[in-house]
Each structure stands twice: as structure tokens, then as C-alpha cells.
């Protein structure tokens, strides 16, 4: 029986010689479970596994804990790859996280974290980040130290409010914190003064809702 090649992430895909951006099947670490992911093979040398994308408001991001755990949407468009896969992957080796942002005026910016991982579900997929560089603010718009993940049905934030219900979307909310890339999608000319929009405070401030976002990860040693 011919042995099937499995890919753990998009860096594996790239190293195998498949260097065209697109959707590839990835396998969970130490498992046969599979997931489909969009691989960006062009940005900064390629090998990036896309874990989130917002671009047109076509997908509802006000989802349950289980949906954020397993992922939703279409990897070629708006989607969330899934906390469980990302957690398992980023605990195998060191990963970097790149967040690419676009505003409605045609400007682009990014934040790059030199070390990123998510705790297991037992610890509510808490985010861990180190070493920020980039053009989307000198201060991290993801609260440091990292917070637990919250969704509309799992209130793990540090507010006497319920951040996920109020701001919409699942995120690593503080009280409620300087970012939420899974907030409500607002079209152009309706995207200001919106506290529940797609926010990256240290680039665009409190009420500005972004046009497009991508979150992607890659092994630090790629």
C-alpha cells in the first residue's frame, strides 16, 4: 500500500515543492484528523497557514465555542481555521503570527509576533504572544499578557459585561481590550464610530472598523 504524504502545516506543503497559494489538506499533529487550510505561498517567502480572514462580511463570525473550536467558513474566503487545530499545531514547535490589516482608505499594515501559541481547550485557548514588530502599532493590540478566548456562549473575559455578546465574535477579550478582528463587518462609510466592529486599536483607534484582515502562522525556523 502506497504511503500517503501528510502535511502538518503550509510550511510542510511548501517544502514538499507545492508552492502555489491555495487550499490544502492538513493533518492534526499525532492524529489522522484533517482540516482544510488556505496556504499563502507568496507573502514573505511563503509557507503561511492562514488561520483567519475577513474581507467582505459574507460570513457570520458571531459563533459558538464549538464552532470556533472546529473552525467555520471557507478557507478561500472569510473563515476561522479552528482553535483546536491551531492550539495543537502551535504547541508542537515555535510559530510566528503575522496579522495583515487593510483599512477603507487603501492603507495596509501588519503586526508580527515572533512567538505565538494557544493553550489547550482546558485553559480556554489562551493566547500567548512575544516579540512584536510591524507597522500596525508599537503596542500590541492583543492584550498582554494574553487572555482566554471568549464566545457568545463562553464568557471568559475580564469585564463585568459580556464582551463577546456586546462586541460580537469570538476573541481573546480583556475588558474588552484593544482589538477584535472577529467583530461585526461594516461596509465603507458605515465603518466609523463602531465599537463592535473589526478593531485594531493601536493602528486605527477605537471606533474604526477595518476592511480586511488576515491572520497567518508559520514555523519560526522556516
Amino acid at each position: 500500500k502506497e504511503e500517503q504524504i501528510t502535511f502538518r502545516d503550509c510550511a510542510d506543503v511548501f517544502r514538499s515543492g507545492l508552492t502555489t497559494s491555495g487550499i490544502y489538506t492538513l493533518t492534526f499533529p499525532n492524529s489522522t484528523e484533517e482540516t482544510k487550510a488556505y496556504c499563502d505561498m507568496e507573502t514573505g517567502g511563503g509557507g503561511w497557514t492562514t488561520i483567519q480572514r475577513r474581507e467582505d462580511g459574507s460570513v457570520d463570525f458571531q459563533r459558538t465555542w464549538k464552532e470556533y473550536k472546529v473552525g467555520f467558513g471557507n478557507p478561500s474566503g472569510e473563515h476561522w481555521l479552528g482553535n483546536e487545530f491551531v492550539s495543537q499545531l502551535t504547541n508542537q514547535q515555535r510559530y510566528v503570527l503575522k496579522i495583515h490589516l487593510r483599512d477603507w482608505e487603501g492603507n495596509e499594515a501588519y503586526s508580527l509576533y515572533e512567538h505565538f501559541y494557544l493553550s489547550s481547550e482546558e485553559f480556554n485557548y489562551r493566547i500567548h504572544l512575544k516579540g512584536l514588530t510591524g507597522t500596525a502599532g508599537k503596542i500590541s493590540s492583543i492584550s498582554q499578557p494574553g487572555n482566554d478566548f471568549s464566545t457568545k456562549d463562553a464568557d471568559n473575559d475580564k469585564c463585568i459585561c459580556k464582551c463577546s455578546q456586546m462586541l460580537t465574535g469570538g476573541w481573546w477579550f480583556d475588558a474588552c481590550g484593544p482589538s477584535n478582528l472577529n467583530g461585526m463587518y461594516y461596509p465603507q462609510r458605515q465603518n466609523t464610530n463602531k465599537f463592535n466592529g473589526i478593531k485594531w486599536y493601536y493602528w486605527k483607534g477605537s471606533g474604526y472598523s477595518l476592511k480586511a484582515t488576515t491572520m497567518m502562522i508559520r514555523p519560526a525556523d522556516f
Partner: antibody, heavy 122, light 112 residues
Framework: EVQLVQSGGGVVQPGRSLRLSCAAS????????MHWVRQAPGKGLEWVSY????????YYADSVKGRFTISRDNAKNSLYLQMNSLRAEDTAVYYC???????????????WGQGTLVTVSS | DIVMTQSPLSLPVTPGEPASISCRSS???????????LDWYLQKPGQSPQLLIY???NRASGVPDRFSGSGSGTDFTLKISRVEAEDVGVYYC?????????FGQGTKLEIK
């Protein structure tokens, strides 16, 4: 535990000045907008002033504009209200209050100080 | 400025019975983001006000579920399903949609 501890109240003559302080602890003070709200004896609540997390945005009620100055020192986790040209109608309990949400999202007051009484009388 | 009108101004209630307070605004409080910036506060005797309900209908953490807020636009209601002795005090609605923020006159809830 979030705490807002106020000081600086007292009895003052009309036309004189007073400075109120509000010392914050238990949260990242520099991330929150802060307010002063007052309550005249036996009356309801009246919003007085607001300052954004960085201090770059400031608003006042018409009744105190030009006489009161709100400020903050994020290094000291402290909020202030400088009250000049005080009038009898400024007599009230003054409360400092913290925005419910951080990063200058104005959705109500999640925490309040204990209040400090300012009495303006000759 | 937006005028907030509460009724009744005095509310005597028997413990275990429901209570309802109305709050009307002189202009709509519905923001373009779909939220009503309307909060409810309780000021117990000798204490500072405390947040009960934010954005019209969201209960703050630690607030008993017998408290509920509803309404949109100009008409809002705070309901207490079963009043308890510890609920006595003055209840205020406050709007934050239009600057400056303004409070209602307050409703004094007392036990019969």
C-alpha cells in the same frame, strides 16, 4: 479588585477653588476613560466631565465649562478635578466613575468611587 | 440636551411582588451600530450608584437575574421579577447615545 478612592472634598467659600482626587487601583488605569458625576443634596445624578484614556479628549457639562478642569496622571493612576470660581449650586457629592469598557468606548460607568462632599458656603 | 423622564418617581412594593420602572427619552437612543446606549443604575441608601443594566438590556456581572432591561428607541423599562428587601434605593436610567450623558430624575423603590 477594582477600587476608586476619592479625596479632597470639604467646605469652601464661593469664588474659591478646590481640587478633587481619585486614586485608581486593580485595573490598567491608562486604558480607561474616566468621568466625574455629581449629586446635589437630596437630588439626582448629574454628569460633570469626561477625560479619555490618554487625556487627549475632554468634555464638560455646560454648567461647569470654563470653571472646572479635569486631568489625569496615568503614571500615578490618578484622576483630578480642579474646581475654580465655585458657586453655591456646585454643592454636591462628587463621584469619580470609570468607563465600563476600556479604550474609550463610552457605554456607561462600571465602577464608582465612594464620593466626596463639596460644600460651597459663605 | 436629551431629557430622560422616569416614572413612577416613587414605587412602594411588597416583597416577592414584581416591579417595573419606565424611562422615556426626548430623542431616540438607537445608535447607528444597532445599540441603545441606555444604562440602569441603583443607588442604595448611603452608597455610590452601581451599574445594573448596560446597553438597554445587558445585565452586569453579579446582578441577580431578577433584574431585566428592555426597550429601544425612546421607551425603556427596568423590571424586577420579585422584589427583595435589598433592592431598596433609587433607580436611575442614563443615556449615552447623545452628548452630554443625561440621567433620569430617579425612582425611589421602597418596601411596603
Amino acid at each position: 479588585e477594582v477600587q476608586l478612592v476619592q479625596s479632597g472634598g470639604g467646605v469652601v467659600q464661593p469664588g474659591r477653588s478646590l481640587r478633587l482626587s481619585c486614586a485608581a487601583s486593580g485595573f490598567t488605569f491608562s486604558s480607561y476613560g474616566m468621568h466625574w458625576v455629581r449629586q446635589a443634596p437630596g437630588k439626582g445624578l448629574e454628569w460633570v466631565s469626561y477625560i479619555s484614556s490618554s487625556g487627549s479628549t475632554i468634555y464638560y457639562a455646560d454648567s461647569v465649562k470654563g470653571r472646572f478642569t479635569i486631568s489625569r496622571d496615568n503614571a500615578k493612576n490618578s484622576l483630578y478635578l480642579q474646581m475654580n470660581s465655585l458657586r453655591a449650586e456646585d454643592t454636591a457629592v462628587y463621584y469619580c466613575a470609570r468607563d465600563l469598557l476600556d479604550y474609550d468606548i463610552l457605554t456607561g460607568y462600571g465602577y464608582w468611587g465612594q464620593g466626596t462632599l463639596v460644600t460651597v458656603s459663605s | 440636551d436629551i431629557v430622560m423622564t422616569q416614572s413612577p418617581l416613587s414605587l412602594p412594593v411588597t416583597p416577592g411582588e414584581p416591579a417595573s420602572i419606565s424611562c422615556r427619552s426626548s430623542q431616540s437612543l438607537l445608535h447607528s451600530n444597532g445599540y441603545n446606549y441606555l444604562d440602569w443604575y441603583l443607588q442604595k441608601p448611603g452608597q455610590s450608584p452601581q451599574l445594573l443594566i448596560y446597553l438597554g438590556s445587558n445585565r452586569a456581572s453579579g446582578v441577580p437575574d431578577r433584574f431585566s432591561g428592555s426597550g429601544s428607541g425612546t421607551d425603556f423599562t427596568l423590571k424586577i421579577s420579585r422584589v427583595e428587601a435589598e433592592d431598596v434605593g433609587v433607580y436611575y436610567c442614563m443615556q449615552g447615545t447623545h452628548w452630554p450623558p443625561t440621567f433620569g430624575q430617579g425612582t425611589k423603590l421602597e418596601i411596603k
